[in-house]
Amino acid sequence: IWELKKDVYVVELDWYPDAPGEMVVLTCDTPEEDGITWTLDQSSEVLGSGKTLTIQVKEFGDAGQYTCHKGGEVLSHSLLLLHKKEDGIWSTDILKDQKEPKNKTFLRCEAKNYSGRFTCWWLTTISTDLTFSVKSSRGSSDPQGVTCGAATLSAERVRGDNKEYEYSVECQEDSACPAAEESLPIEVMVDAVHKLKYENYTSSFFIRDIIKPDPPKNLQLKPLKNSRQVEVSWEYPDTWSTPHSYFSLTFCVQVQGKSKREKKDRVFTDKTSATVICRKNASISVRAQDRYYSSSWSEWASVPCS
Amino acid sequence: RAVPGGSSPAWTQCQQLSQKLCTLAWSAHPLVGHMDLREEGDEETTNDVPHIQCGDGCDPQGLRDNSQFCLQRIHQGLIFYEKLLGSDIFTGEPSLLPDSPVGQLHASLLGLSQLLQPEGHHWETQQIPSLSPSQPWQRLLLRFKILRSLQAFVAVAARVFAHGAATLSP
């Protein structure tokens, strides 16, 4: 058993049929010694008396808010949550496995640049009695500070018969060093509580591996005289790290016909312009990637050919 | 050439070679063998490798003030990785394919380090760590981890040389 926060405790249980459970001793936070009784949740049934209460925690029915009273007055509360371990593996019932980039990916994170700011998100089908708390650090043995905001509900989607809820959080490394080569990963830890179930999820990454630039901006076409060719030009996204001579991007320019089946013409360039043939009803798209480190490509920025 | 005394390196040559190194490091990575282990090998093998850290002067401001600190750190890393790529980790079982980009990568690391340090000048280099793989699967794991770490290192080096070529070239 360990304390999650003041008066909230997590009991770790091996979860299998007829498991013995854990013996837990609760102590009433009071100078009083006599006449103390204990109840669970809204029930008025007295579970025991005395300053301490010993219980065998085996199932969710044994978890909840234990309250000690004296003469009708509440002295203190202890909320017990359960953390299930099945066959040596902690349960992951609350969050959905996003399966990208690999199985057992519950938290996904992205950064738009090297400033030390990043966003993480996760999915659940649970709509009520759900709380999240997020902590983060750079490294784990001698952790350096990362400040995270509160997790918020950022999207709701219908998936078949189910509703899916997306939560996200923004974090910022306290003393980021954009130009350095990271040697210690960022650690993100999410505590999830649904009713009386506790679970924790972690992700470990380098900012360089979660970089996804915003799409190029100001995408423009300039027809070339007496030719089907056009000059496409664009600019670095505002959110990308500066100076651009140091934090350089590379670009992919694509000409795509109306039909998805049509052959795509692609050009790769380090410049912020390219010359391509503009076909009728086609569109021109450009996306960006870090020039020196193969993290994610940005989404496409697009303009019609006409 | 980056003479330890303080003259400028051939920024444009260094830029071209460091960008080639980036490409080679990424093309070598998937080719050192099928690898599920990399998904689970969570402990850092690379704590002993020379990283380009915050105080090494490799940021744009630091390069403007005095690029020598940064160039020395890059040189140190290049020599270090060159030694690792020539060690038993890459030469032992399982054998790399004859056309593996690791050979080219090894040669290019040496090439860039020589551009930075002409004959007769010596910056101190870091000892190669004893990673002591005794099994082929351990070598394979280390190859992945070393190449991942090298990708990060050469990315910073390439940024340095690109910025130098754009802003510090005579």
Partner: antibody, heavy 121, light 111 residues
Framework: EVTLKESGPVLVKPTETLTLTCTVS????????ISWIRQPPGKALEWLGV???????NYNSGIKSRLTISKDTSKSQVVLTMTNMDPVDTATYYC???????????????WGQGTTVTVSS | DIVLTQSPDSLAVSLGERATINCRAS??????????MHWFQQKPGQPPKLLIY???NLESGIPDRFSGSGSRTDFTLTISSLQAEDVAVYYC?????????FGGGTKVEIK
């Protein structure tokens, strides 16, 4: 289908040399390592040695001086030679494939049926 | 050499009940976060069969009532609901250092 089959004498006299051959099919010896493992009657398993994809070998130091493992990749055969046999070497000898280096980390994914060798005069 | 000690030596469990076998190594069998510990099942007159590799990965074709956990020196094989066909001897094996070594085996029977 992956198969490994051990062949060789079932009876060997003390001080003689044992030669066992492992013939494999369904995979190439240039892609997978082969280990030899033995199991005395009613006892646990003992690893004897391995021949790697590139032809290098490692042996159990306890019996290293008596062991040689070699292979002929084109014939898909691995040969175990063990000199100076003794009654305590009576065991079932297995030829075993070590799983893909990058996934299995030294786990042995396919085993031959084993050949029982008795050392007796 | 790395010594692997299995416990218990034998285990009698009722059908449908849980069976747990432990394997303790004399030194860590982890290499940079990878546990080179594997579990095998051997039935009489048959060669051993790989069940679990790298401590917790289920070999293809093995029922998911088998699971493995642990790291460094302490490892566990669990059969969540014992079936009649699970009666066998179970061995752990490490491949972190030469020589590869096996545990002494745990015999699982039906109560």
């Amino acid at each position: 289908e992956v198969t490994l089959k051990e062949s060789g004498p079932v009876l060997v006299k003390p001080t003689e040399t044992l030669t066992l051959t492992c013939t494999v099919s369904g995979f190439s010896l240039s892609s997978y390592a082969i280990s030899w493992i033995r199991q005395p009657p009613g006892k646990a398993l003992e690893w004897l040695g391995v021949i790697w994809t590139g032809g290098g070998t490692n042996y159990n130091s306890g019996i290293k001086s008596r062991l040689t493992i070699s292979k002929d990749t084109s014939k898909s055969q691995v040969v175990l030679t063990m000199t100076n046999m003794d009654p305590v070497d009576t065991a079932t000898y297995y030829c075993v494939r070590e799983g893909d280096y990058g996934s299995y980390a030294g786990a042995m994914d396919y085993w031959g049926q084993g050949t029982t060798v008795t050392v007796s005069s | 050499d790395i010594v692997l000690t299995q416990s218990p030596d034998s285990l009698a469990v009722s059908l449908g009940e849980r069976a747990t076998i432990n394997c303790r190594a004399s030194e860590s069998v982890d290499y940079y976060g990878i546990s080179s510990m594997h579990w095998f099942q051997q039935k009489p007159g048959q060669p051993p069969k790989l069940l679990i590799y790298r401590a917790s990965n289920l070999e293809s074709g093995i029922p998911d009532r088998f699971s493995g956990s642990g790291s460094r020196t302490d490892f566990t094989l669990t059969i969540s609901s014992l079936q009649a066909e699970d009666v066998a001897v179970y061995y752990c094996q490490q491949a972190n250092k030469d020589p590869y070594t096996f545990g002494g085996g745990t015999k699982v029977e039906i109560k």
